[in-house]
């Protein structure tokens, strides 16, 4: 989804130095949407570089991005959300490189929050719950969540569970007894909208009980 050329012959004709990526967030601030772009090369000299989006907008032809340190950012209600927009890196009036992007395909949800784990002694299981702001949204309402947990000593040995609800049950027998666990969750669009994983929620830490130990609710550490 990049650039403009006559026939495809100029497929990769833009200067690679200016390649960039973007993500959209819908209803991120009330009914306002946002679009965030950044250069893939952190060493690009961005002093005179601007970003502009044209097409698939309501009431206006083009919008300019605001520069916030090394990222470029728009917050607006003016995204049509149907059709492709042309996002260009510009120096003055000259376009250096452009991408044709449908903003509904680059959606990055907000990170889940309020992650917690409760141990149920009678059921010998752990109930994992979390919240997401998307339950209140009108567009990106349907998400797939990725819950990842690990024993704290196993630095890269994460177990992942995909789910569409905000509640998960982990069986005690699947976990090591008397161990400290870290758990976190992220989200990705799952109906019509496409895009990227959200940032991870803050991690929650819990300890599994000793075998035959009755510890009740799992407290955060």
């Amino acid at each position: 989804e990049s650039g403009y050329a006559q026939n495809g012959d100029l497929e990769d004709a833009e200067l690679d130095d200016y390649s960039f990526s973007c993500y959209s967030q819908l209803e991120v601030n009330g009914s306002q949407h946002s679009l965030t772009c950044a250069f893939e090369d952190p060493d690009v000299n961005i002093t005179n570089l601007e970003f502009e989006i044209c097409g698939a907008l309501v009431e206006v032809k083009c919008l300019n991005f605001r520069k916030l340190q090394e990222i470029y950012f728009i917050e607006t209600k003016k995204f049509l959300l149907i059709g492709k927009s042309n996002i260009c890196v510009k120096v003055g009036e000259k376009s250096l490189t452009c991408k044709k992007i449908d903003l509904t395909t680059i959606v990055k949800p907000e990170a889940p929050f309020d992650l917690s784990v409760v141990y149920r002694e009678g059921a010998n299981d752990f109930v994992v719950t979390f919240n997401t702001s998307h339950l209140q949204k009108k567009y990106v309402k349907v998400l797939m969540h990725d819950v990842a947990y690990r024993q704290e000593k196993d630095e890269n040995k994460w177990t992942h569970v995909n789910l569409s609800s905000t509640k998960l049950t982990l069986l005690q027998r699947k976990l090591q007894p008397a161990a400290m666990y870290e758990i976190k969750v992220r989200s990705i669009p799952d109906h019509y909208f496409k895009g990227f994983w959200s940032e991870w929620s803050p991690s929650y830490y819990f300890r599994t009980p000793e075998i035959n130990n009755s510890s009740g609710e799992m407290d955060p550490i």
């Epitope: 989804e1 990049s2 650039g3 403009y4 050329a5 006559q6 026939n7 495809g8 100029l10 497929e11 698939a56 049509l80 959300l81 149907i82 059709g83 492709k84 044709k100 449908d102 509904t104 395909t105 009108k138 567009y139 019509y192």
Partner: antibody, heavy 118, light 111 residues
């Protein structure tokens, strides 16, 4: 100007295969997905599937899986639709169409008539 | 699959009069204010031509006598003042869910 030019009419025998081409011009080939739509004689329109020329990724109507294969060639800005094991019910006009957005079709080829007859 | 039912099947309207075509879907094709319904015109021997996308957005170059409205499961294409060149078959199409389906078509003729 933006154009999709399709290959000419084909007459095939039952059981044969046919490959229809659609050459894009007037825009950057990898910017837009290209789709195929079937119109049987005197009938309405039926979406077959689409291809993203940038990635080669495809999406098919379940009804046409196994019948249709979509491919693209970035060097010639051309997409192809191959129909296999042809039967009389495959007789139709086949259109390629550019997807201006998800998923509506803002530019259409002129159509390719495929006739299956023994 | 989402079924699109157009009505009427055919329509005869006097020149300069209003023509209205309806399209009903078997399930909602809207996500809040995003209405994934599109309208095409097809003349004999020609490919379809996009008129309206997103229920109400007029495609570039299409005369403004064409307009679209509706949401959820009920959509309408209106030709405010029928011209001779508008004689054609009109199709609606949804794009919320694969397979992307079309209505059966409405034939518009001059009365």
């Amino acid at each position: 100007q933006v154009q999709l030019v399709q290959s000419g009419a084909e007459v095939k025998k039952p059981g044969a295969s046919v490959k229809v081409s659609c050459k894009a011009s007037g825009y950057r080939f990898t910017d837009y997905e290209l789709h195929w739509v079937k119109q049987a004689p005197g009938q309405g329109l039926e979406w077959i599937g689409g291809i993203d020329p940038k990635t080669g990724g495809t999406a098919y109507n379940q009804k046409f899986k196994g019948k249709v294969t979509l491919t693209s060639d970035r060097s010639t800005s051309t997409v192809y639709m191959e129909l296999s094991s042809l039967r009389s019910e495959d007789t139709a006009v086949y259109y390629c169409a550019r997807s201006g957005g998800r998923w509506y079709f803002d530019v259409w080829g002129q159509g390719t008539t495929v006739t299956v007859s023994s | 699959d989402i079924v699109l039912t157009q009505s009427p099947d055919s329509l005869a309207v006097s020149l300069g009069e209003r023509a209205t075509i309806n399209c009903r879907t078997s399930e909602s094709v809207s996500i809040h204010l995003l209405h994934l319904m599109h309208w095409y015109q097809q003349k004999p021997g020609q490919p379809p031509k996009l008129l309206i996308y997103g229920a109400s957005n007029l495609e570039s170059g299409v005369p403004d006598r064409f307009s679209g409205s509706g949401s959820e499961t009920d959509f309408t294409l209106t030709i405010s003042s029928l011209q001779a060149e508008d004689v054609a078959v009109y199709y609606c199409q949804q794009s919320i869910k694969d397979p992307y389906t079309f209505g059966g078509g409405t034939k518009v003729e001059i009365k």
